[in-house]
């Protein structure tokens, strides 16, 4: 008894295709060894037609493939454009030769079944509608017209011109004529189901002079499209249901034991399991829409169906599209924390993975919002300026080439809690979801800046110090000047902080930044932070206001400083207005054109290409002069 198994008998029709699944025992050797499909000859020889090593015979060229699904211990042979010559005995098997483990499969390809010679064939998908054309002679114009469905014994009425309708076709069948043409009538049947498939006869008149026409209606269930995705990656279900359902609510559901459970619909329903990682995007007025799911999990694998109905729920006789999603656990996407925890007033540094082969791609960070159909407005990007409400507390650090970029958010509040996405304008599979949780702080922050209300006087020397605990002793400390294009790390020279020391004096651990002499351009947000190599850690922020010397107090309270931050930003608006104009000039600007939101998330079209410097640590327009010094004590 062979441990390989599959269908013993496969039958199909000329011109159609088959998909033969062969199962193999769950061992590492089996998963990686050669898979083959061969045809048995009279001599007992089995001639390879296709194998997983890339071999494809001439007779299968352009019409067959073999796909291995190691996590399911199966491989699938797909053969298209079948002919009667394909009828025969085959083997699917494993091993370096065709004498390895195998399973016998018999394939029979028949001619298209003979129908009465005048039969008209209509082939439609489930949920669609069909209009059957029934010609007749002029003398039968005044006579009754009808359509009936053939059963074993009789022909059961569907509809006739006296307005009789079979109960199972009420509201679905219409008999009509077009214009003044008295030689043809039509029957339209909508919301087709499998039960509607079969042979029909349309008739005008009675007795031997009646006009009759045979109709074969084939109602096809959509073939599930196979989607093969990596764990932690993302998938887009592109659903094209046609113009007739353009105004109906749309849904995506997953087949369960007895039902298809709705995951998301355009009426606001969303499965909690997909919170923070799903969007539904109406594409156009033709009934097209897409559903994007990020952060794929093993349990997301399964049979999905999209459809349209006013209820936003699956309904028999309405158009559908189906997919079989496989989630490959051998993922190229690194396993990162999906939940990041911060405290109020503190900071988080989020490492976002991207395809290392696409280091020059534009990187983005957006906040998932669940209202409506879900959307994800971009908060920061390598060439997208930081959103105004995140001024002074959000920056993206691109580390070219290492497959990671870092997003830092500080001055956290409980409002920041939620779901965020890392994404690029490159490989869409590398979209990842992070949940940010923010708890109330119960102790002092690790990094503290003094003085806290910082006002520097024009032309003078100004020093701010950042106190850090001993646990950060061995890490690199830095100051950077924040702008809405990033946080530019200021040059520092290390004065002995790296010297080996047995003890660490908690009170004396600080890194200082000195502005000498202070200029108007020095006004703005500054961050003090720690990092280890390319791994960023905690940060804290301070706003430094710059004033001309006055006789009165030089103290400015933080609210004024923040107000001034806004002013400083507005003075820089010239740049951003240019970039907005450039955005508008881009044809098909893609997901980020619409108010910087990820709308058509499935499209990897040209992204928002705002002008200006990149938001990387080294991409600032203003170089810092030697007046900025860091002193480590």
């Amino acid at each position: 008894k062979s441990p390989i198994f599959g269908p013993q008998e496969v039958s199909s029709i000329e011109g159609d295709s088959v998909s033969i699944t062969c199962y193999y025992p769950d061992t590492s050797v089996n998963r990686h060894t050669r898979k083959y499909w061969c045809r048995q000859g009279a001599s007992g020889m089995c001639t390879t037609l296709i194998s997983s090593n890339g071999y494809l015979s001439k007779e299968y060229s352009g019409r067959a493939n073999l796909i291995n699904f190691p996590e399911n211990n199966t491989f699938v042979i797909n053969i298209e454009q079948l002919t009667q010559d394909d009828t025969g005995s085959y083997k699917c098997g494993l091993g370096t030769s065709n004498r390895g483990l195998s399973f016998d499969v018999s394939l029979e390809v028949s001619q298209v079944p003979e129908l009465p010679s005048d039969t008209h064939v209509y082939t439609k998908d489930i949920g669609r509608n069909v209009t059957i054309e029934c010609p007749f002679k002029r003398e039968n114009a005044p006579s009754k017209k009808s359509l009936c469905k053939k059963t074993n014994q009789s022909c059961e009425l569907v509809i006739d011109s006296t307005e009789k309708v079979n109960p199972s076709y009420i509201g679905r069948a219409k008999l009509f004529m077009k214009g003044t043409d008295l030689t043809v009538f039509y029957v339209n049947i909508s919301h087709l189901t499998h039960n509607d498939a079969g042979l029909y006869i349309c008739q005008a008149g009675e007795g031997p002079s009646a006009d009759k026409k045979n109709v074969d209606l084939q109602v096809l269930a959509p073939e599930p499209e196979l989607l093969y995705k990596d764990l932690r990656s993302s998938v887009t279900f592109e659903c094209d249901l046609g113009r007739e359902v353009a105004n109906e609510a749309k849904y995506l559901c997953r087949m369960n034991k007895e039902t298809c459970d709705v995951i998301i619909n355009t009426l606001g329903k969303r499965d909690p399991d997909f919170e923070g990682r799903i969007l539904i995007t109406p594409k156009d007025d033709n009934g097209r829409f897409s559903v994007l799911i990020t952060g794929l999990r093993k349990e997301d694998a399964g049979h999905y169906q999209c459809g349209a109905h006013s209820s936003g729920l699956p309904q028999e006789g309405w158009p559908i599209q189906t997919w079989q999603l496989f989630v490959n656990e051998e993922s190229t996407i690194p396993n990162r924390r999906s939940v990041v925890k911060g405290v109020t007033g503190g900071s988080v540094a989020i490492a976002c993975p991207y395809n290392p082969k696409e280091s020059s791609s534009l990187k983005y960070w957006c906040r998932w919002e669940g209202d409506g159909n879900g959307h994800c407005p971009v908060l920061v990007g390598t060439q997208a300026q930081v959103q105004e409400e995140y001024e002074g507390r959000l920056a993206l650090f691109d580390q070219p080439g290492n497959g990671t970029y870092t997003v830092i958010l500080n001055q956290l509040t409980t409002e920041d809690a939620g779901f965020y996405w890392c994404l690029t304008n490159g490989d869409s599979r590398w979209r990842t979801t992070i949940e940010l949780q923010v708890a109330e702080a119960t102790r002092e922050p690790n990094l503290e800046v003094t003085p806290q209300n910082a006002t520097a006087v024009l032309g003078e020397t100004f020093t701010v110090s950042c106190h850090y605990p001993c646990k950060f002793y061995s890490q690199e400390k830095y100051w950077c000047k924040w702008s809405n294009k990033g946080c530019h790390i200021l040059p520092s020279h290390d004065e002995g902080a790296r010297q080996s020391s047995v003890s660490c004096d908690q009170s004396s651990q600080l890194v200082s930044m000195t502005l000498n002499p202070v200029s108007k351009e020095d006004e703005g947000w500054y961050w003090c932070g720690v990092k280890q190599g390319q791994t960023y850690g905690e940060t804290t922020a301070i706003y430094i206001a710059v004033e001309e010397r006055t006789r009165g107090s030089s103290h400015v309270n933080p609210t004024d400083a923040n107000a001034r931050a806004k002013v400083a930003l507005e003075e820089e608006v010239v740049d951003s207005s240019i970039s907005e104009k450039e955005n508008k000039a881009i044809p098909n600007p893609g997901p980020f054109a619409n108010e910087r939101e990820i709308q058509n998330v499935g499209d990897q079209a040209q992204e928002n290409r705002a002008s200006g410097d990149a938001g990387s640590a080294d991409g600032q327009s203003r170089s810092s002069s030697s007046k900025h010094h860091h002193h480590h004590h």
Epitope: S11, D16, E223, C260
Partner: nanobody, 127 residues
């Protein structure tokens, strides 16, 4: 409520034939695969045969002990399933269960892979 209803069971002599039928009117959609299992007293449920549909192609699967003797057929539009059993042996005595819609990934020979089940029909083959 999904119901699979088997019929056609009975008592026959060895080498006789019998035809089992299964109707699944309550399935929420057309099943892509339906099958037969059997369970003899004190034994595990055993895979007998299955049929799968895709487009206009049909796939038939048989358990090793019935290959060549049993033929599975059905209509996926109507969710009906038949099992023609010829050359019956006393060891074919069991309760025969109809099953529908297995997990796409699962080994269809294991009962755990199938979603819907009938109540079963008794087949007794006397020697």
């Amino acid at each position: 409520e999904v119901q699979l209803v088997e019929s056609g069971g009975g008592v026959v002599q060895a080498e006789d034939s019998l035809r089992l039928s299964c109707a699944a009117p309550g399935l929420p959609f057309s099943s892509s695969r339906m099958g037969w299992f059997r369970q003899a007293p004190g034994k595990e449920r055993e895979f007998v045969a299955a049929i799968g549909w895709s487009g206009r192609s049909t796939y038939r699967y048989y358990g090793d002990s019935v290959k060549g003797r049993f033929t599975v057929s059905g209509d996926n539009a109507k969710n009906t399933l038949d099992l023609q059993m010829k050359g019956l042996k006393p060891e074919d005595t069991a309760v025969y269960y109809c099953a529908a819609d297995p997990d796409y990934y699962g080994d269809y020979r294991t009962s755990g892979a199938w979603r819907y089940w009938g109540q079963g029909t008794q087949v007794t083959v006397s020697s």
